[in-house]
């Protein structure tokens, strides 16, 4: 049809802390580069119907459904969704397309369904139906990669079973210790499956989609390493694949590699070799032992042997179902106002978890170390010296780990009050808690130093939020005490705060700090 | 349960000679390697030797040429032979059979 208009459909996602992203449905700014919806003619449908493909969006997610008309003249047009009209402003761009938007903010299920646009332009009438749906992420898995053997070739497939599909890529690194981390110059990325390269020193295999990024490392014993103290220890669970490479380097050719399982040699068929001259001449070995698919009976110490270097073993466990060993007896800690401190907590766990730090309801990002014994640490600075109740949390498939701290900061007490018509009362957070005295200012007394000890009522209660003890002491008004000032004081070992009250003054009652 | 029992150490004098032993029961003594390490005070522990299965002898570079490691299927028990020692070899000796430890035994070299 000639007086068709040339139309183009489009899905524009906002990143969520988008501040451009406006309430009309107007034109917010772009924030991401648009994806193309198509915007086919349905066939079979009375009148012109275009269909925008399915758009899929994440919950709490920002995007903008956008048509480009270009038609001559003028465009008028309406939004209908769930039988209820929106309003619709269109406007032109530069090269004088039509543009009409819908901006749908922090997507729920109410805002999942069919949305309509009908335009009119002075050539003809039609229609673009969207259809907007929330992803099911509770479909979604990302699953830690393992490896397989290529068939018939000396290669490494790595294989992650997620959903959606992953991007795999291996991280490979040929130097030791730290220059290894994720962002070093020493680290080489591959976004692919398979692996040919198999010498380096570090290889890591990782997966990621929009659960996020999940990797494995290739369990390496380095024979022309010095024997550790602690026997490296891999965990498995019953029906996960078996890998661990032995490698090592010799001046020449003349040594061989073998693996035995608690002193038996290793089947064939559970073993393959390869080798290769390095760029100084020096030969390379490595060694696979791998098991396709353990079973309990596959624990043991698994050791591999050179004629010219040192044996060396590793403990491999099977175990039934993943675990998280570590102590979770809360901790108390009291600190300075400037001390430099970390909570950490030190761990054993298979599969790896995934970790928080929270703080009065706000959660911050958990790093964790492995350490040469085969344990785990995840340390937490960034407490700002507020003190509380710190609460870090670990899970993996199998398991849930939780452990509390508590965050107590050494410091001189300061005192707030208020006062009523019965009473007085003192507040203060210093730690350690403080201890009160009350005093009556008079003439016989003009440095208030009359001690009251009748009426007297101290106690400590838990500020909730943060898990922090304020301590409060109120006087009852007695007729002694009426008109007169009092003090009251706070102190601890590292100093004294005071507030002076007039007591049944008349309107609000006056407060003199008093350090 | 794997036991390993270290003896022989003692007070020498530098340049003088020790002899460490290690005897284990518990354990299939002639199917495993054995590793000599030491700690000394303030240190990290350190491997020293290690003999095979099959007799081959390994050594760390600070100790070749002077130490000999020997073992004796029969008895159960690995030595190590200790010669020119220096007064950097003042540490507590220990014997390792995989994941499992003796208690060790002192060596003092001080004039």
């Known amino acids: 049809n000639q007086d068709l208009p040339v139309i183009k459909c489009v899905l524009i996602n906002h990143k969520n802390n988008d501040s451009s992203v406006g309430k009309s449905s107007s034109y917010p700014m772009v924030s991401e580069s648009p994806e193309d919806l198509g915007c086919a003619l349905r066939p079979q449908s009375s009148g012109t119907v275009y269909e925008a493909a399915a758009v899929e969006v994440d919950v709490s997610a920002s995007i903008t459904l956008q048509v480009l008309v270009d038609a001559p003249g003028n465009i008028s047009c309406l939004w209908v969704f769930k039988h209820s009209s929106l309003n619709c402003q269109p406007h032109f761009d530069l090269q004088n397309r039509g543009v009409v938007s819908m901006v749908i903010l922090k997507m729920t299920e109410t805002q999942a369904g069919e949305y309509l646009l009908f335009i009119q332009s002075e050539a003809t009438n039609y229609t673009i139906l969207f259809t907007v749906s929330i992803r099911n992420t509770l479909l979604y898995t990302l699953r830690r990669p393992y490896f397989r053997k290529m068939e018939n070739q000396d290669a490494l497939v790595c294989i992650s079973e997620s959903v959606p599909e992953p991007i795999v890529e291996w991280v490979l690194c040929d130097s030791q210790g730290e220059s290894c981390k994720e962002e070093s110059p020493a680290v080489v990325k591959k976004e692919e499956k398979v692996l040919h390269e198999l010498f380096g020193t570090d290889i890591r295999c990782c997966a990621r989609n929009e659960l996020g990024r999940e990797c494995t490392r290739l369990f390496t014993i380095d024979l022309n390493q010095t024997p550790q103290t602690t026997l490296p220890q891999l965990f498995l669970k019953v029906g996960e694949p078996l890998w661990i490479r032995c490698k090592a380097v010799h001046v020449n050719h003349g040594f061989g590699l073998t693996w035995e399982l608690e002193n038996k040699a290793l089947e064939e068929g559970n073993y393959f070799e390869m080798s290769t001259y390095s760029t100084n001449r020096t030969m390379i070995r490595i060694l696979f032992a791998f098991v396709s698919s353990v079973a309990r009976n596959d624990t043991g110490y698994y050791t591999c042997s050179s004629s010219k270097h040192p044996s060396q073993s590793a403990l491999v466990t099977i175990v039934e179902k993943g675990f998280i060993n570590a102590t979770n007896s809360s901790e108390d800690y009291e600190i300075d106002q400037y001390e430099e401190f970390c909570f950490s907590v030190r761990f054993k766990a298979y599969p790896q978890i995934r970790c928080t730090w929270t703080f009065s309801r706000k959660s911050f990002p958990c790093e964790q170390k492995g350490l040469d014994n085969g344990y785990s640490i995840s340390k937490f600075c960034n407490h700002k010296h507020q003190p509380g109740e710190y609460i870090f949390h670990a899970e993996n498939d199998d398991a849930q780990f939780t452990k509390m701290f508590t965050l107590n900061i050494r410091r001189k007490p300061q005192v707030l009050a208020e006062a009523s018509a019965s009473q007085a009362s003192c507040f203060s957070d210093g730690y350690p808690l403080p201890s009160w005295t009350w005093k009556k200012c008079s003439d016989k007394s003009p440095n208030c130093t009359e001690e009251i000890t009748e009426g007297v009522w101290n106690r400590k209660a838990n500020r909730k939020v943060f898990g922090q003890w304020v301590s409060s002491s109120t006087l009852n008004m007695s007729e002694a005490i009426k008109g007169f000032l009092v003090k009251c004081c706070a102190y601890n070992s590292l100093g004294t705060s005071c507030e002076t009250i007039l007591l049944n003054s008349p309107g609000p009652f006056p407060f003199i700090q008093d350090n | 349960q794997v036991q390993l029992q270290e003896s022989g150490g003692g007070l020498v004098q530098p340049g003088g000679s020790l002899r460490l032993s290690c005897a284990a029961s518990g354990v299939t003594f002639s199917i495993s390697y054995i590793d000599w390490y030491r700690q000394a005070p303030g240190n990290e522990r350190e491997w020293v030797a290690q003999i095979t299965r099959g007799g081959d002898s390994f050594y760390a570079d600070s100790v070749k040429g002077r130490f000999a490691i020997s073992r004796d299927n029969a008895k159960n028990t690995v030595y190590l032979q200790m010669n020119s020692l220096k007064p950097e070899d003042t540490a507590v000796y220990y014997c390792?059979?995989?994941?499992?430890w003796g208690q060790g035994t002192q060596v003092t070299v001080s004039s």
């Open positions: 390792r059979i995989l994941s499992y």
